[in-house]
């Protein structure tokens, strides 16, 4: 015998209290698949979260973060404070990158400058707190007397800011 609940489409639930008829999901709830016996409560985007997509009867709300914060975790389960380029977030707040490291985004960690010699290349543009070095040709490719290092390009916002 076919389960009568299998006929209930997304946006409804199979209501045991009403002889297993398909009832619409109540306000602030949803069912994203058919044949559900309950509707799920919609996620609420509060505080540092803001609504990216409203809840509907067939899909959950989606949150992102208010300006100055960025998403972390699956489905933006957490919001983390932004820092400036050239900084990283520590337990004590935003701290400048140490010499030899950089961060070209408002999130994430300071990473070591690329080791150009790893690829047999020279440093074409010096690194800064906000920018990685740019590796150039191998030292053998440089013409005699040519300067191998260019001063770093000035870092500007937004730089490699997360979208």
């Amino acid at each position: 015998l076919q389960d009568p609940c299998s006929n209930c489409p997304a946006g409804t639930f199979c209501d045991n209290n009403r002889n297993q008829i398909c009832s619409p999901c109540p306000p602030n709830s949803f069912s994203s698949a058919g044949g559900q016996r309950t509707c799920d409560i919609c996620r609420q985007c509060k505080g540092v979260f803001r609504t990216r997509k409203e809840c509907s009867s067939t899909s959950n709300a989606e949150c992102d973060c208010t300006p100055g914060f960025h998403c972390l975790g699956a489905g933006c389960s957490m919001c983390e404070q932004d820092c400036k380029q050239g900084q990283e977030l520590t337990k004590k707040g935003c701290k400048d990158c140490c010499f030899g490291t950089f961060n070209d985004q408002k999130r994430g960690i300071c990473r070591p400058w690329t080791n150009c010699s790893l690829d047999g290349k020279s440093v074409l543009v010096n690194g800064t707190k906000e920018r990685d070095v740019v590796c150039g040709p191998s030292p053998a490719d440089l013409s005699p007397g040519a300067s191998s290092v260019t001063p770093p390009a000035p870092a500007r916002e937004p730089g490699h800011s997360p979208q």
């Epitope: 070209d104 400058w113 690329t114 740019v134 150039g136 390009a153 490699h160």
Partner: antibody
């Protein structure tokens, strides 16, 4: 020598998912970003996102945030891109690329993987 | 996102001709501008990085110049093997973006 070898062509039905692989060799996999780039038929190039295999840190183009998931397996020097809820507009050649020296240009490209979405 | 306006979209030139392609980002990208060649078989190759730096192994007939919001790619003497589509790309700001490409044909 540096090589990026991608998995073969895929044909998928709308709504399905596909996972494209990119096996790197000839360099230290964990020291360079791997990027993914889309080229739809007759179109230009679109950056999807990238991953730093050392710690699996990722960046995504907002346009592809709900479409693509980029991962990396350090033990096999392989990067992956999974595309979900496929639609006809996802039909394209997908390239993996490596950054050049620092994360601002792409010096090596895979041969491309054609993904066709058709019912 | 930074828009990259590349022109022309296609051009036809003779062997030995000087060929110039321009790329104009919608905002200042310093020198973080790269040029790629895509051959008819779909293989892609980096030719020039950081505006004017020739990638090792790339023939010296290819060159690049410019800064900020105005960049130029030049082939000083076109060769038959240069038949390809050429793309510019900015590496200054995420998401990285490409020009729409210039399809180069031999007359």
């Amino acid at each position: 020598q540096v090589q990026l070898v991608q998995s073969g062509a895929e044909v998928k039905k709308p709504g399905a998912s596909v996972k494209v692989s990119c096996k790197a060799s000839g360099y230290t996999f964990t020291s360079y970003w791997i990027n993914w780039v889309k080229q739809a038929p007759g179109q230009g190039l679109e950056w999807i996102g990238n991953i730093y295999p050392s710690d699996s840190y990722t960046n995504y183009n907002q346009k592809f945030k709900d479409k693509a998931t980029i991962t990396a397996d350090k033990s096999t020097s392989t990067a992956y891109m999974e595309l979900s809820s496929l639609r006809s507009e996802d039909t394209a050649v997908y390239y993996c690329t490596r950054d050049y020296g620092s994360s601002y240009s792409f010096d090596y490209w895979g041969q491309g993987t054609t993904v066709t979405v058709s019912s | 996102d930074i828009q990259m306006t590349q022109s022309p979209s296609s051009l036809s030139a003779s062997v030995g001709d000087r060929v110039t392609i321009t790329c104009r980002p919608s905002q200042d990208i310093s020198n973080y501008l790269n040029w790629y060649q895509q051959k008819p078989d779909k293989t892609v190759k980096l030719l020039i990085y950081y505006t004017s730096r020739l990638r090792s192994g790339v023939p010296s007939r290819f060159s690049g110049s410019g800064s900020g919001t105005d960049f130029t790619f030049t082939i000083s003497s076109l060769q038959p093997e240069d038949i390809a589509t050429y793309f510019c790309q900015q590496g200054d700001t995420l998401p990285y973006t490409f020009g729409q490409g210039t399809k180069l044909e031999i007359k």
